[in-house]
């Protein structure tokens, strides 16, 4: 695309190129042949994050505690507030408009990736040689106990939900 009649950080209005307002400011009046563009800073709890010709600033996002949200980063005149979720909860979308409780991994499954404020717990089935006997959002699959290292023998085989049961070796008579 060839360049347009007005340069970057300018806009075309009534046959002239006016300067855009910088981030954090809104347009009060367009430039004329004799005057510059007039801009005003955004008010408290407002922002504009681009060079713009907006006549109203945007309201900062509200992190509603009733939806499990809290402020991760306070907004400025140039940036929106960033919300995240309370401990034990995660965002339901990229915009983080509400939160849901982290899921727990059922017995037979372990935590592959612990949940964050923006992503849920990722579970994986415990492979052979590993087990999980609890429902947890933190516990990984644990390896079965090694009876041999304790000079014991397996009395009951392990499963993905239970550890092996070790017992003493039969004594030769």
């Amino acid at each position: 695309e060839p360049p347009t009649a007005c340069r970057e950080k300018q806009y075309l209005i009534n046959s002239q190129c006016c300067s855009l307002c910088q981030p954090g400011q809104k347009l009060v009046s367009d430039c004329t042949e004799f005057t510059e563009t007039e801009c005003l800073p955004c008010g408290e709890s407002e922002f504009l994050d681009t060079w713009n010709r907006e006549t109203h600033c945007h309201q900062h996002k509200y992190c509603d505690p009733n939806l499990g949200l809290r402020v991760q980063q306070k907004g400025t005149s140039e940036t929106d507030t960033i919300c995240t979720c309370e401990e034990g909860w995660h965002c339901t979308s990229e915009a983080c408009e509400s939160c849901v409780l982290h899921r727990s991994c059922s017995p037979g499954f372990g935590v592959k990736q612990i949940a964050t404020g923006v992503s849920d717990t990722i579970c994986e089935p415990c492979p052979v040689g590993f087990f999980s006997n609890v429902s947890s959002a933190f516990e990984k699959c644990h390896p079965w106990t090694s009876c041999e290292t304790k000079d014991l023998v397996v009395q009951q085989a392990g499963t993905n939900k239970t550890d092996v049961v070790c017992g003493p070796q039969d004594r030769l008579r």
Epitope: C6, S15, Q16, C17, T32, E33
Partner: antibody
Framework: QVQLVQSGAEVKKPGASVKVSCKAS????????IEWVRQAPGQGLEWIGV????????NYNEKFKGRATLTADKSISTAYMELSRLRSDDTAVYFC?????????WGQGTLVTVSS | DIQMTQSPSSLSASVGDRVTITCRAS??????LNWYQQKPGKAVKLLIS???RLHSGVPSRFSGSGSGTDYTLTISSLQPEDFATYFC?????????FGQGTKVEIK
Amino acid sequence: QVQLVQSGAEVKKPGASVKVSCKASGYGFTNYLIEWVRQAPGQGLEWIGVINPGYGGVNYNEKFKGRATLTADKSISTAYMELSRLRSDDTAVYFCARGGSGFAFWGQGTLVTVSS
Amino acid sequence: DIQMTQSPSSLSASVGDRVTITCRASQDISNHLNWYQQKPGKAVKLLISSTSRLHSGVPSRFSGSGSGTDYTLTISSLQPEDFATYFCQQGNTLPWTFGQGTKVEIK
């Protein structure tokens, strides 16, 4: 005083191109946009496009995109409007105008007649 | 594109009359409305820019008003040299568009 002097009348055949010039004087040529407008016989005004003579940036009316080409030569304070693939309904008076707040100053117009 | 509807398309008036021409835009044009005068064989003249700003050298009998979509050009006391065609034009959104014109004739 500000003056925009356009080239003389042209008669063209359908399918041909025409290039109209607009020589500016009395102000800083690169400080203002140059607008192009046409007026068919007995009709209203129709905007063609605008050029920034300072660096050649342009905006066109979608209707003329691909057929109209706006250029400017800073060294001689002259803007040009070329219209290609002419049709009989392109018969009109073509105007250049200096921007500012609105089309502040106008050329006298150039009659382009398209006829076989 | 923004449509500009000008009325009346023509009017007959006498010297000294007060004349009003209106222009309606198909959407809000934020006061970016200009008025022009065209006489046969003469260069088009800008009369008023941005709704109400009189262009340099234009007599004060010409005035403009309006907002949003509705705008008015008023000639307070028509003079012989004012018999001409008048156009409105919006400069808010590309492509710039014009009204169809109002021809002011001698009664």
